[in-house]
């Protein structure tokens, strides 16, 4: 869907100069943003988002891909998002991450902090079209989760599904499959607690078409499991080897968007853990 | 830039088959449904179905449900539209077309079913 | 199936004056999502139809802002607000609400 150009994160082909290439990218409705909490607004008729089918994804296998831009895993369109205005299914859902002995890795932050790495699971608008790609050029065509990731004690089973595999897509184009297992549990706990805002792929061609849920609480990794996926994948099909790391991209401005959350904040500050 | 080009004028005898074919380029093939529509002479436009491009599975509307078939060839960015057992009231033009919105069109391809 | 319903001919217009053409739908086109599923196509002579309008108002890419097009669930107005000789040809609603997906018989565009 980028229409086959090429893009990095840095260097002569990277964030930018995305816009020289893929103009929208240079729009004013981009993505990620940095969430101010005492700036959002509250919206009592936000509700807790209910994802259909996350914990009995099928019996196939999932299709596991290094793009050279991240891991991304496909998603049978049995998965699907109930609280949203439309019907959203489940395509794919894909990682962010910084590299070894650096803060940051997320794309969203939270009153200006960043987490190790975050993921994305991505819908699209079934009412209206037929694949993801129609859907990713209109607006609010595709809805995104975005789960911001932190360092724990223990090692979370659910992302250990999706990081126990990552060996066998070491280098761009490798594909493998991985046994069905519960999404659900990638998942924060308490899905009531989210900011809505409408905003961009992170990624060429940065269409404008996204409908945001970004979790307040987050998810959980182990520091073992945050490193193999900062040191397992390659960006680059053979040698010379590139690590693929940092495939995050900066903050983009608000401009006049509003962010909505569906709770009220106890206070201004970022908590984390479960109440 | 996307582009879809279709096949040449075709000029067949009732009861013999026609594959048209659609090539796609400037774009993945498998990341966007391909609906094909007819047109017969000095008339307006009819849908008759979709094929779902990255698993193959075709959808007809009623009146090209039997004769006509959706198929692809999608290391080479091809989709078919094949019609069996033709009869004269299949003469048209015949357009492929991406997604649901039909963004882009194929230039079409004429069938003429003649004795 | 869901019938669209179309004039055959528009009324005559002038070249720089504006033009409406109508079309009606035998059931709502309004999802319980919000959006209606009515798109027009032009098809100038000889050639390929061309995306005009998707979702009843919203403009398809490279089209000029000279078209808009707005309406009911089932009845609608495409609007043409300064023809140019361009513009000839005749266009089509269709909706895309339930399959089969279905197109209006078409309105040929007059030029006076």
């Known amino acids: 869907a980028d229409g086959g150009q090429h893009w990095t994160y840095e260097g002569p082909h990277g964030q930018d100069h995305w816009p020289a290439s893929y103009p929208e990218c240079g729009n004013n409705a981009q993505s990620p943003i940095d969430i101010q909490t005492d700036s959002v607004t509250f919206d009592p008729d936000l509700p807790a988002l209910q994802p259909h089918g996350y914990d009995q994804p099928g019996t196939e296998p999932l299709d596991l891909h290094n793009n050279g831009h991240t891991v991304q895993l496909s998603l049978p369109s049995t998965l699907y998002l109930g609280g949203l205005p439309r019907k959203y299914v489940a395509a794919q859902l894909h990682l962010h991450w910084g590299q070894k002995g650096s803060p940051g890795g997320s794309e969203h932050q939270i009153n200006s902090e960043a987490t190790f790495a975050e993921l994305h699971i991505v819908h699209y608008d079934s009412d209206s079209y037929d694949s993801l790609s129609e859907a990713a050029e209109r607006p609010q065509g595709l809805a995104v989760l975005g789960i911001l990731i932190e360092v724990g004690e223990t090692k979370n089973i659910a992302y250990e599904h999706i990081l126990s595999h990552l060996h066998e897509v070491r280098h761009k184009d490798q594909k493998t499959s991985v046994p069905p297992f519960n999404l659900r549990e990638l998942l924060p706990k308490q899905l009531g607690q989210y900011f809505r805002y409408n905003g961009s792929l992170t990624t060429p061609p940065c269409y404008q078409s996204v409908l945001w849920t970004v979790f307040y609480r987050r998810s959980q990794i182990s520091m073992e499991q945050l490193e193999k996926l900062q040191g397992t994948l390659f960006s680059t099909e053979e040698e010379p080897s590139k690590l693929l790391v940092q495939n995050y991209r900066a903050l983009q401005p608000l401009n006049q968007r509003m962010v909505f959350a569906s709770f009220i904040q106890a206070g201004s500050s970022y908590t984390t853990g479960e109440m | 830039q996307v582009k879809l080009e279709q096949s040449g004028p075709e000029l067949k005898k009732p009861g013999e088959t026609v594959k048209i074919s659609c090539k796609a380029s400037?774009?993945?093939?498998?990341?966007?449904?391909m609906h094909w529509v007819k047109q017969a002479p000095g008339k307006g436009l009819k849908w008759m179905g979709w094929?779902?491009?990255?698993?193959?599975?075709?959808t007809y509307a009623d009146d090209f449900k039997g004769r006509f078939a959706f198929s692809l060839e999608t290391s080479a960015s091809i989709a078919y539209l094949q019609i069996n057992n033709l009869k004269n009231e299949d003469t048209a033009t015949y357009f492929c077309t991406r997604g649901r919105e039909r963004g882009f069109w194929g230039q079409g391809t004429t069938l003429t079913v003649s004795s | 199936d869901i019938v669209m319903t179309q004039s055959t001919f528009s009324n005559p217009v002038t070249l720089g004056t504006s033009a409406s053409i109508s079309c009606r739908s035998s059931?709502?086109?309004?999802?319980?999502?919000?959006?209606?599923?009515l798109y027009w196509y032009l098809q100038k002579p000889g050639q390929s139809p061309q995306l005009l309008i998707y979702?009843?108002?919203n403009l398809a890419s490279g089209v000029p802002d000279r078209f808009s097009s707005s309406g009911s669930g089932t009845d609608f107005t495409l609007r043409i607000s300064r023809v140019e000789a361009e513009d000839v040809g005749v266009y089509y609603c269709a909706q895309n609400l339930e399959l089969p997906y279905t197109f209006g018989g078409g309105t040929k565009l007059e030029i006076k």
């Open positions: 400037g774009y993945t093939l498998t990341d966007y449904s």
């Open positions: 094929i779902n491009t990255e698993t193959g599975e075709p």
């Open positions: 059931k709502s086109l309004l999802h319980s999502n919000g959006i209606t599923y």
């Open positions: 979702q009843m108002s």
